[in-house]
């Protein structure tokens, strides 16, 4: 067990003469906050997949108002570290996504609005217990500087936090064959004997006699690589004779879910279903209210007006999870042909076709858009003898030369309010509606009726979420 720590040093204009405009103004003061998402580094997960190693949200930074005419300086930052606790071994290689969010504090009806300013991602190697490592990342016109480290929580030590330390039994030295526990020289490495035969490379133990597997390995002695070969056993592939495992210790053994969460096995790991008021990979995060905007993807937050009362997220179609953070993956059937990229929009599947293909499932082969140029990263699509440009986010018009306002078309139904957002737009729904475009009534045709206005929200307040 241990903690990943992230220290944001600065967020400001990138190098070069073209400084960006300040994200805040006298009319719209704002403040920053940051979100970090961690995943084991070598997992083949999609960008939207859960933050399997954990996630954290910073406090809000000081309120900032732009000085008229001045270029954007480094913006004031929240105090303190972002900390992401991890329960198992530190994987050594990890992937991160760090998002910089702006909270506008103008005269917003129903409270502040959020928008994403920058998002950076990377994969790094990092030994627990090592020094701080520094990263400098550019995201558009902005530059983010930060440092990070992973440290073990006592009694764990070592580069993966898998060795244990115990106080010395004798004042002078450690027992036979045991080393002092650097940097805790007054403690000794515990005589931790894993189950006989437990793989030294792929297994570890936190208690004598056990054998726990690092990600990607399975079997009683962690000697079997996880693969997708078909097996009768629910534990997945294994032994040399059958290619399948004799059921051994499973990921839910000992229930890794905290705070009364219930554990269910998934093909790769486990999943916690958390009780109201708790969330996170292991239900370890609590004290969240609807005011913190815990429901993602247009989910409707009900209850939770204060930290002692729980909240619940009602998810729109296409999303699930205690915080509507998980997309129901209908793309796994690979409906898009000719290498098209599948997008599950919740209410519909959409295929983004490679150049030269079109149709709802990219089934039509087109001629090249010879000599036709789409500006600003737009892609040319030909069909029926005419070319058109499929424009990148933020641009529109026949040749993608016009700056587009994603909210101009008033896409939010039933009085929902629209905000520009890194993925296009976000709808803040009026009470009684939910969904990515506020298209779903909360209790259609007498289905499980919810209160017209959740506790703690006045009728007319839009629902807010990150």
């Amino acid at each position: 067990a241990g903690v990943f720590e992230l220290q944001i040093h600065s967020f400001g204009p990138g190098p070069g003469p073209g400084a960006p405009r300040s994200p805040c103004s006298a009319r719209l003061p704002c403040r920053l906050f940051f979100r970090v998402c961690l995943k084991p580094g070598l997992s083949e997960e999609a960008a939207e997949s859960p933050c399997a190693l954990g996630a954290a949200l910073s406090a809000r930074g000081p309120v900032y108002t732009e000085q008229p005419g001045a270029p954007a300086p480094d913006l004031p930052l929240p105090d303190g570290l972002l900390q992401v606790p991890f329960r198992d071994a530190w994987p050594g290689t990890f992937s991160f996504i760090i998002e910089t969010w702006r909270e506008e504090l103008g005269d917003q009806i129903g409270g502040p609005a959020w928008s994403l300013l920058a998002r950076v991602a990377g994969r790094r190697r990092l030994a627990a217990g090592g020094p701080w490592a520094r990263d400098i990342q550019r995201a558009g016109a902005w530059e983010l500087r930060f440092s990070y480290r992973a440290r073990c929580e006592p009694p764990a030590v070592g580069t993966a936090c898998t060795r244990l330390c115990r106080p010395r039994s004798a004042p002078s030295r450690c027992g036979p064959g045991l080393r002092p526990c650097a940097p805790l020289e007054d403690e000794c490495e515990a005589p931790l004997v894993c189950r006989a035969g437990c793989s030294p490379e792929h297994g570890f133990c936190e208690q004598p006699g056990e054998c726990r597997c690092l990600e990607g390995w399975t079997g009683p002695l962690c000697t079997v690589p996880v693969s997708t070969s078909s097996c009768l056993s629910p534990r997945g592939p294994s032994s040399a004779t059958t290619g399948c495992l004799v059921p051994g210790p499973g990921p839910c053994d000992g229930n890794p879910c905290a705070n009364g969460g219930s554990c269910s096995e998934t093909p790769r790991s486990f999943e916690c279903t958390c009780p109201r008021g708790f969330y996170g990979l292991r239900c370890e995060v609590s004290g969240v209210t609807c005011a913190d905007g815990p429901c993602f993807n247009g989910g409707l937050c009900v209850g939770g007006a204060d930290p002692d009362s729980a909240y619940i997220c009602h998810c729109p179609p296409g999303f699930q999870g205690s915080n509507c953070e998980k997309r129901v993956d209908r793309c796994s059937l690979q409906p898009c042909r000719n290498g098209g990229l599948c997008l599950d929009l919740g209410h519909a599947l959409r295929c983004r076709c490679r150049a030269g293909f079109a149709g709802p499932r990219c089934e039509h082969d087109l001629d090249d858009c010879a000599g036709r140029a789409c500006a600003n990263g737009g892609t040319c699509v030909e069909g029926g003898g005419a070319h058109r440009c499929s424009c990148a986010l933020g641009f529109g018009g026949r040749d993608c030369r016009e700056r587009a306002d994603p909210c101009a078309a008033r896409p939010c139904a039933h009085g929902g309010r629209c905000y520009a957002h890194f993925s296009g737009l976000v709808c803040a729904c009026a009470p009684g509606y939910m969904g990515a475009r506020c298209e779903f009534p909360v209790h259609p045709d007498g289905a499980s009726a919810l209160p017209a206005a959740p506790p703690g929200l006045r009728p007319g307040d839009p629902q807010r979420y990150l």
Partner: antibody, heavy 117, light 107 residues
Framework: EVQLQQSGPELEKPGASVRISCKAS????????MHWVKQSNGKSLEWIGN????????NYNQKFEGKATLTVDKSSSTAYMQLKSLTSEDSAVYYC??????????WGQGTTLTVSS | DIQMTQSPASLAASVGETVTITCRAS??????LAWYQQKQGKSPQLLIF???SLEDGVPSRFSGSGSGTQYSMKINSMQPEDTATYFC?????????FGGGTKLEIK
Amino acid sequence: EVQLQQSGPELEKPGASVRISCKASGYSFTDYNMHWVKQSNGKSLEWIGNIDPYYGGTNYNQKFEGKATLTVDKSSSTAYMQLKSLTSEDSAVYYCARGGNNYGDYWGQGTTLTVSS
Amino acid sequence: DIQMTQSPASLAASVGETVTITCRASENIYYSLAWYQQKQGKSPQLLIFNANSLEDGVPSRFSGSGSGTQYSMKINSMQPEDTATYFCKQAYDVPWTFGGGTKLEIK
């Protein structure tokens, strides 16, 4: 104006070592990483590694571990790369480049290393 | 290491023509892609970073797009001074890895 001035061309014998320098000016030296890149006979580019002048931390491409050693002298705003046990495979143009962890925005003019007996 | 496959290896274009160079990564690199231009006997120059952000001072005829594993750079109206070799580079993971390069010549 940001500038990276690299040392001149080098002719070395197989088995020798060489140290290439990269003097930075026009910006605060410890604010950015220094990356080193190899280009063999005008073909593609290979990243050797980088050094963070502030902390002194280094990252190496596994292929160049044991071959290249990166150091800095903060007082003179200079980055160095030492290459040891030279062979003809090490003959190339070597560049230093200022940058962060996801970009390299200013490059030195390159140092040509020829290894020949 | 992440492999970068760049195509085509070479091409010739007329002045005013639109040119597209593509780069495929062996795994998702989450927009951490840069494009460099290298003229004969010179150092590489950063054109585009984060897949689609244009570096200061780079003409607007250059643009970048893509996501996941597929990325491309477009030169909207080829100019004689664009004759050079172009490289893509992923910076999502260490080591940085470059594509094999595309040699662009004027027709």
